[in-house]
């Protein structure tokens, strides 16, 4: 398996009650606006064929996509949560900027691409779904990177 380096976040990033609560509140509010309950973005299949030790790198890719293609374009919605959560997630992304995999990451890119394609195919409702799954993104980042 490829070796991942610098793919680590300090536990303290996920032990801040206020921002954790705001992230979950944002997810809950967006999920109420999500009428497509059949599709799941962050679930078992995202990790298909990806070893546990590679998953922080995978989640880094998902986080960066979510920030750039979902949260920034939708930044005027779901206030006041959005204006607090986006900078927090951007800080996590910055801390993972040196997280890389030595070797082939094609299997990871394939899984991330499926998530991207699903969001793009669903259009705005895909973006709302991604925001509605920020709780799952948060928990998966915590599990994968601490």
């Amino acid at each position: 398996a490829p070796i991942s380096s610098h793919c680590r976040l300090d536990k303290s990033n996920f032990q801040q009650p206020y921002i954790t609560n705001r992230t979950f509140m944002l997810a809950k509010e967006a999920s109420l606006a999500d009428n497509n309950t059949d599709v799941r973005l962050i679930g078992e299949k995202l990790f298909h064929g990806v070893s546990m030790s590679e998953r922080c790198y995978l989640m880094k890719q998902v986080l960066n996509f979510t920030l750039e293609e979902v949260l920034f374009p939708q930044s005027d919605r779901f206030q006041p949560y959005m204006q607090e959560v986006v900078p927090f997630l951007a800080r996590l992304s910055n801390r993972l900027s040196t997280c890389h995999i030595e070797g082939d990451d094609l299997h990871i890119q394939r899984n991330v691409q499926k998530l991207k394609d699903t969001v793009k195919k669903l259009g705005e409702s895909g973006e709302i779904k991604a925001i509605g799954e920020l709780d799952l993104l948060f928990m998966s980042l915590r599990n994968a990177c601490i």
């Epitope: 398996a1 962050i42 679930g43 078992e44 299949k45 990790f47 298909h48 070893s51 546990m52 030790s53 928990m139 998966s140 599990n143 994968a144």
Partner: antibody
Framework: EVQLQESGPGLVQPSQTLSPTCTVS????????VHWVRQHSGKSLEWMGR???????SYNSAFTSRLSITRDTSKSQVFLKMNSLQTEDTGTYYC??????????????WGPGTTVTVSS | DIVMTQTPSNLAASPGESVSINCKAS??????LAWYQQKPGKANKLLIY???TLQSGTPSRFSGSGSSTDFTLTIRNLEPEDFGLYYC?????????FGSGTKLEIK
């Protein structure tokens, strides 16, 4: 309460097919993966394969050619089918549920197992 | 496949004592090791995963440590119900593989 229960014939003839059933309750097969693990008597555990929540499957390459895992979500059942049985396939067969969607390789809940003897 | 070497095979101890069981992986598995307890007539029980995370319901006298290739399960202040078989399992990658087991008996 999460529960898994294996069932199947205790005795199978050599060269025949083994087909235990895992019946689950307390969770949905469309939300969690179910794995099959076997244990030769008094020996270690051996992971055989997995039924993903979306119906896909993964197998241990040691069994791939003779192993098949299917399910019936309406009956909350997962089926193992292994053909060309030999006496060394004698043992206890377990089904187990993954912890959650992230810790999908962690076997959090197990059935009591079904004992299979391969003998003529 | 990753080979898990578990030691010792047998262990005898008295209630109140502390014991340690070791597991070594043939290649690095980061922190992704689980420990299970097996007792006759009972379903196998997940005790610890990710090396040191206690599964819900696991008593605090159980602890896991280690990373990369070397891991340890420690049981402090042994209770009568702790005696049985213990297995380690790497849950980093497929195929999932288990150690050969440690039989913990009452001295």
């Amino acid at each position: 309460e999460v529960q898994l229960q294996e069932s199947g014939p205790g005795l199978v003839q050599p060269s025949q097919t083994l087909s235990p059933t895992c019946t689950v309750s307390g969770f949905s097969l469309t939300s969690y993966s179910v794995h099959w693990v076997r244990q030769h008597s008094g020996k270690s555990l051996e992971w055989m394969g997995r039924m993903w929540s979306d119906g896909d499957t993964s197998y241990n390459s040691a069994f791939t050619s003779r192993l098949s895992i299917t399910r019936d979500t309406s009956k909350s059942q997962v089926f193992l089918k292994m053909n060309s049985l030999q006496t060394e396939d004698t043992g206890t067969y377990y089904c187990a549920r993954s912890l959650d969607f992230y810790y999908d390789t962690t076997l959090a809940f197990w059935g009591p197992g079904t004992t299979v003897t391969v003998s003529s | 496949d990753i080979v898990m070497t578990q030691t010792p095979s047998n262990l005898a101890a008295s209630p109140g004592e502390s014991v340690s069981i070791n597991c070594k992986a043939s290649k690095t598995i980061s922190k992704y090791l689980a420990w299970y307890q097996q007792k006759p007539g009972k379903a196998n029980k997940l005790l610890i995963y990710s090396g040191s995370t206690l599964q819900s319901g696991t008593p605090s006298r159980f602890s896991g440590s280690g990373s990369s290739t070397d891991f340890t399960l420690t049981i402090r202040n042994l209770e009568p119900e702790d005696f049985g078989l213990y297995y380690c399992q790497q849950h980093n990658e497929y195929p999932l593989t288990f150690g050969s087991g440690t039989k913990l008996e009452i001295k």
